[in-house]
């Protein structure tokens, strides 16, 4: 666990030519103020896409108006830093949006406004616990100057602050298989994370997983007391009153407290101290009300009927989130069928489609049978995202415009002779054998295999087959 | 064919938790967004708001924001609808139900939800 | 917000009639307007989409029409198996919005 530090400098035009105009006015004075959003990696990601390792919103600034005829100077600052708590390990590469909002404080009707007045990106790689890092982005005409650094909450360490330090409890060394921490060499790294369960008191680890017994105890997790000799040296039971080993992982390991509040130990757990704007057991529910502005983009922010929701930000059309700070994304909506693009407008959401495609939402397969016609009486025939059609008789090819050789493929059977006919085939059947096909044999004494022959028809005789 | 089967009544008290389940098949479930309707007793349908499959970012109605929570589960094909600190006036019928660019094509059978103490 | 208001919350036809269910919206939307069908056991269907097409597997019987504010569901030949309420949605507009509903039963 640890803060993300950030502190802005100043503010201000950049260099060069197209100084940008003063975002405050004597008509229209205002206030500035930083929201900071940070994600783990070196990901290019949206503006809008979630802050995965925290955000920040400063205090608002002094009230600057506008001197006439002055060009825009660096705007009056917020006092103090922007501190993200983050609760995991410092993932080393992060990726940072910094945004400058301006607060209008006119006559607004229904309170101040806001609007984004600058947004910087970057990409970086910092080691918790290192100097501050000073940067300098441009957006637009205007810059921005400012400092960051990672740093860890006690008892957390290191570059990552994964590892976890504890005072000594002994005045000349550390605990078995525990190194000082470096740079508080009077303090001492606690054990590793041992295996689950292992006893806090009498169990120690030099590799994750295992629990070793300090003298005088046994079992797998070194709850099991061996003999009653008291704390003699270093390596004794410990007790809470001869304090003899740095203690064991405690209730405020890992910070359960949220939001950057602090961890006390108490006999039965511990207490969390939370900064303002925050309150419940570890911090988790914020106390932030419609007095602190905290919805974005012009939301209209009503108070909350419970304390899981101390406020609502109603938002206007576009935007989104609990501080209505995203813009609303329509194409998240998935909108485009087939692999279609999708690009929202803001008017309108329109779908780029892949070939073969079309339709507002490529919903179309130009290839099916939308719009496509069989010649010569043929249907069409759907499947697999292509299409076919199914001729009728005498009629072949892809739209069944090509004239097919109905007897091609020798259709009647028996020796039978085949005839192309304007509506098909005909087949004259060999003596003994009857049917469309010629299929059916003639029985002697007359009789068919079918129940009758049609009517008008003698066994024998041409069939046209329809 | 295309289905959503959604988990089954719940009775729960005030302040707990309740996690609702929806089951997609017979289709590409990324290729869809899954969204979430609410209809309370005698009454219409409420749209809570949306999850996109895809990358898991879900938006909800302004009536939906704090207390409720969409999410995936994508290798089993499932979007979940959690709603913490039950309060009596969530006792409704919840929909899960599929987006095809154009409207809700294809809708879950409820999840009766009763909020008593 | 696009606030759907479906004017008639029930109406009562016979087996064989033609019959109209209306909805109007507060700003114009595009056409993204649908009409769904709730039956009695609670399962939701979609019928018409982007105000006239009408859904896979969905009788002819039903069609859609309307533009601007002004939108409407038709079923030409009511059948008992028709009996349902009818919501309309639009689909325009975060957030997407239901009428009222119409609630249709046979006389």
């Known amino acids: 666990a640890g803060v993300f530090e950030l502190q802005i400098h100043s503010f201000g035009p950049g260099p060069g030519p197209g100084a940008p105009r003063s975002p405050c006015s004597a008509r229209l004075p205002c206030r500035l103020f930083f929201r900071v959003c940070l994600k783990p990696g070196l990901s290019e990601e949206a503006a809008e896409s979630p802050c995965a390792l925290g955000a920040a919103l400063s205090a608002r600034g002094p009230v600057y108006t506008e001197q006439p005829g002055a060009p825009a100077p660096d705007l009056p600052l917020p006092d103090g830093l922007l501190q993200v708590p983050f609760r995991d390990a410092w993932p080393g590469t992060f990726s940072f949006i910094i945004e400058t909002w301006r607060e209008e404080l006119g006559d607004q009707i229904g309170g101040p406004a806001w609007s984004l007045l600058a947004r910087v990106a970057g990409r970086r790689r910092l080691a918790a616990g290192g100097p501050w890092a000073r940067d300098i982005q441009r957006a637009g005409a205007w810059e921005l100057r400012f400092s960051y650094r990672a740093r860890c909450e006690p008892p957390a360490v290191g570059t990552a602050c994964t590892r976890l330090c504890r005072p000594r409890s002994a005045p000349s060394r550390c605990g078995p298989g525990l190194r000082p921490c470096a740079p508080l060499e009077d303090e001492c790294e606690a054990p590793l994370v041992c295996r689950a369960g292992c006893s806090p008191e009498h169990g120690f680890c030099e590799q994750p997983g295992e629990c070793r017994c300090l003298e005088g105890w046994t079992g797998p997790l070194c709850t099991v007391p061996v003999s009653t000799s008291s704390c003699l040296s270093p390596r004794g039971p410990s007790s809470a009153t001869t304090g003899c080993l740095v203690p064991g992982p405690g209730p405020c390991d890992g910070n359960p407290c949220a939001n950057g509040g602090s961890c006390s130990e108490t006999p039965r757990s511990f207490e969390c101290t939370c900064p303002r704007g925050f309150y419940g057991l570890r911090c988790e529910v914020s106390g932030v009300t419609c007095a602190d502005g905290p919805c974005f983009n012009g939301g209209l922010c009503v108070g909350g009927a419970d304390p899981d929701s101390a406020y609502i930000c109603h938002c206007p059309p576009g935007f989104q989130g609990s501080n209505c700070e995203k813009r609303v994304d329509r194409c998240s909506l998935q909108p485009c069928r087939n692999g279609g693009l999708c690009l929202d407008l803001g008017h309108a959401l329109r779908c780029r489609c892949r070939a073969g495609f079309a339709g507002p939402r490529c919903e179309h397969d130009l290839d099916d049978c939308a719009g496509r016609a069989c010649a010569n009486g043929g249907t069409c025939v759907e499947g697999g995202g292509a299409h076919r059609c199914s001729c009728a008789l005498g009629f072949g090819g892809r739209d069944c415009r090509e004239r097919a050789d109905p007897c091609a493929a020798r259709p009647c059977a028996h020796g039978g002779r085949c005839y192309a006919h304007f509506s098909g085939l005909v087949c004259a059947c060999a003596p003994g054998y009857m049917g469309a096909r010629c299929e059916f044999p003639v029985h002697p004494d007359g009789a068919s295999a079918l129940p009758a022959a049609p009517p008008g028809l003698r066994p024998g005789d041409p069939q046209r087959y329809l | 064919q295309i289905q959503l089967v959604q988990s089954g009544p719940e009775l729960k008290k005030p302040g707990e938790t309740v996690k609702i389940s929806c089951k997609a098949s017979?289709?590409?479930?990324?290729?869809?967004?899954m969204h979430w309707v609410k209809q309370a007793p005698g009454k219409g349908l409420k749209w809570m708001g949306w999850i996109n499959t895809e990358t898991g970012e879900p938006g909800y109605a302004d009536d939906f924001k704090g207390r409720f929570a969409f999410s995936l589960e994508t290798s089993a094909s499932t979007a979940y609808l959690q709603i913490n600190n039950l309060k009596n006036e969530d006792t409704a019928t919840y929909f899960c139900?599929?987006?095809?660019?154009?409207?809700?094509?294809?809708w879950g059978q409820g999840t009766s939800v009763t909020v008593s103490s | 917000d696009i606030q759907m208001t479906q004017t008639t919350s029930s109406l009562s036809a016979s087996l064989g009639d033609r019959v109209t269910i209306s909805c109007r919206a507060s700003?114009?939307?595009?056409?993204?307007l649908n009409w769904y069908q709730q039956k009695p056991d609670g399962t939701v269907k979609l019928l018409i989409y982007?105000?006239?097409r009408l859904h896979s597997g969905v009788p002819s019987r039903f069609s859609g029409s309307g533009s601007g504010t002004d939108y409407s569901l038709t079923i030409s030949n009511l059948e008992l198996e028709d009996i349902a309420t009818y919501f309309c949605?639009?689909?325009?507009?975060?957030?997407?919005?239901f009428g009222g509903g119409t609630k249709l039963e046979i006389k």
């Open positions: 949605q639009q689909g325009d507009m975060l957030p997407w919005t």
């Open positions: 017979g289709y590409t479930f990324t290729d869809h967004s």
């Open positions: 700003q114009d939307h595009s056409n993204y």
């Open positions: 982007y105000t006239s």
């Open positions: 139900a599929r987006y095809d660019g154009y409207a809700m094509d294809y």
